[in-house]
């Protein structure tokens, strides 16, 4: 969470951003809020990116003003038009690219003053893992697959019964480059699994952490997975 202020005294407004991460090829959101104005005509939102000459996006006098927009963002940005009046300047970024990573500035002008805050935006690929029993293997084996990750993540197995155990000797992880030559498919196999136990396959890079759980009993198999973005700390 980053809170920025304007110049001084009554001419400053508070602008707040939250560091976030974008998933390559999908839509992302750069989060920014500000002290709302009561009327739309006086609100100006400017998004800028460090190292980029043109604007990322500008919203002014109630509409997008894109004449100064940088080519790399053409046709890929939008504010939430209905939310601007209540202080939401967040930017939707379509088809996130690896090169969209960097430092962005959310700059706001209202009838009450000016303010800005920076936002660190990371880009990469992350996806939910799915853990299945590999019935083709000769022994009881679990297979954890996640279709898209970048940068290359680490994969760690854990077990509810054998807490703290190191499974690196009885697991094998491979990374297969996807067709677009950036993201990779993650496949990790865990051997010698025991019944009536819950196993977790944890995939993590500097952007996201995802976990796929599987509980194997004699009568049923239960699966659960979740993904968490690793936002940078408050500053």
């Amino acid at each position: 969470l980053i809170i920025g202020f304007g110049i001084s005294g009554r001419h400053s407004i508070t602008v707040t951003t939250v560091a976030s991460a974008g998933n390559i090829g999908e839509d992302g959101i750069l989060s920014c809020t500000f002290e709302p104005d009561i009327k739309l005509s006086d609100i100006v939102i400017q998004w800028l990116k460090e190292g980029v000459l043109g604007l990322v996006h500008e919203f002014k006098e109630g509409k997008d003003e894109l004449s100064e927009q940088d080519e790399m963002f053409r046709g890929r940005t939008a504010v939430f038009a209905d939310q601007v009046i209540v202080g939401n300047a967040s930017l939707r970024l379509k088809n996130v690219q690896l090169t969209d990573a960097g430092t962005y500035k959310c700059y706001i002008i209202t009838s009450k003053g000016k303010g800005n805050a920076n936002l660190e935006y990371k880009t990469g690929a992350f996806s939910m893992p799915e853990v299945n029993v590999d019935y083709n293997a000769s022994s009881e084996t679990l297979r954890c697959e996640a279709p898209r990750w970048f940068p290359q993540p680490t994969v760690v197995w854990a077990s509810q019964v054998d807490q703290g155990a190191n499974f690196s000797e009885v697991s094998n992880t491979s990374f297969e480059l996807n067709s677009e030559n950036v993201t990779m498919k993650v496949v990790s196999v865990l051997y010698n699994v025991t019944i009536n136990n819950t196993y977790s396959c944890m995939i993590e890079n500097d952007i996201a952490k995802a976990t796929g759980d599987i509980k194997v009993t004699e009568s049923e198999i239960k699966r659960r997975s979740h993904l968490q973005l690793l936002n940078s700390k408050a500053s």
């Epitope: 002290e35 709302p36 104005d37 009561i38 009327k39 739309l40 005509s41 006098e61 109630g62 509409k63 038009a81 209905d82 601007v84 009046i85 209540v86 202080g87 009450k112």
Partner: antibody, heavy 115, light 107 residues
Framework: EVQLVQSGAEVKKPGASVKVSCKAS????????MNWVRQAPGQRLEWMGG????????EYNEKFKGRVTITVDTSASTAYMELSSLRSEDTAVYYC????????WGQGTLVTVSS | DIVMTQSPSSLSASVGDRVTITCKAS??????VAWYQQKPGKAPKLLIS???YRYTGVPSRFSGSGSGTDFTFTISSLQPEDIATYYC?????????FGGGTKVEIK
């Protein structure tokens, strides 16, 4: 759940003042504008003004400037609208409404000005 | 002040009919127009903000369109519970102003 609960109906004599309260709950009171709107019988809705509690920023409709005073008590999450020098045409239902989209409204307070 | 001229002032339609209300602003308000529904003895309720964005929980039969000075509010299939007065409002500049209202009745 967002709720705006207004004070009860008032009957006032011409020339007097009235103060209507609006107690907010279910959201962060200081981070949204609170507006006051009135509706006289057979008339259109009329925005009187608004206040941003966090900063005390106030915007008034010029039509009411000098007669209307909007205040807040942030510790009680309550907004107030005081209208002075009342005349018969001020007879109306007065509403408080949250944020610049008027997304939530109070139940209304009937103010009757009569001699 | 920006004047919002709403028409018609009243209309009568059958259940299932498509109902259209128009609102004309005296100057350009971009897309800063909201629509409210008010039932007798009740406070208004926000239906549409920023011309076309349905507010949370508002049925999909309500929609809005337009920009600049001309705006339209539509009920695609009128229901008995839609009997009310509908108001447009601009939040582009102060003073914020409302239309005169359209009273919708069932035939």
């Amino acid at each position: 759940e967002v709720q705006l609960v207004q004070s009860g109906a008032e009957v006032k004599k011409p020339g007097a003042s009235v103060k209507v309260s609006c107690k907010a709950s279910g959201y962060t009171f200081t981070s949204s504008w609170m507006n006051w709107v009135r509706q006289a019988p057979g008339q259109r809705l009329e925005w009187m003004g608004g206040i941003y509690p966090n900063r005390g920023n106030i915007e008034y409709n010029e039509k009411f400037k000098g007669r209307v005073t909007i205040t807040v008590d942030t510790s009680a999450s309550t907004a107030y609208m005081e209208l002075s020098s009342l005349r018969s045409e001020d007879t109306a239902v007065y509403y408080c409404a949250r944020d610049s989209r008027f997304s939530y409204w109070g139940q209304g307070t009937l103010v009757t000005v009569s001699s | 002040d920006i004047v919002m001229t709403q028409s018609p002032s009243s209309l009568s339609a059958s259940v299932g009919d498509r109902v259209t209300i128009t609102c004309k602003a005296s100057q350009d308000v971009r897309t800063a127009v909201a629509w409210y529904q008010q039932k007798p003895g009740k406070a208004p309720k926000l239906l549409i903000s920023s011309t076309s964005y349905r507010y949370t929980g508002v049925p999909s039969r309500f929609s809005g369109s337009g920009s600049g000075t001309d705006f339209t509010f539509t009920i695609s299939s009128l229901q008995p519970e839609d009997i009310a007065t509908y108001y447009c409002q601009q939040h582009y500049s102060t003073p914020l102003t409302f239309g005169g209202g359209t009273k919708v009745e069932i035939k």
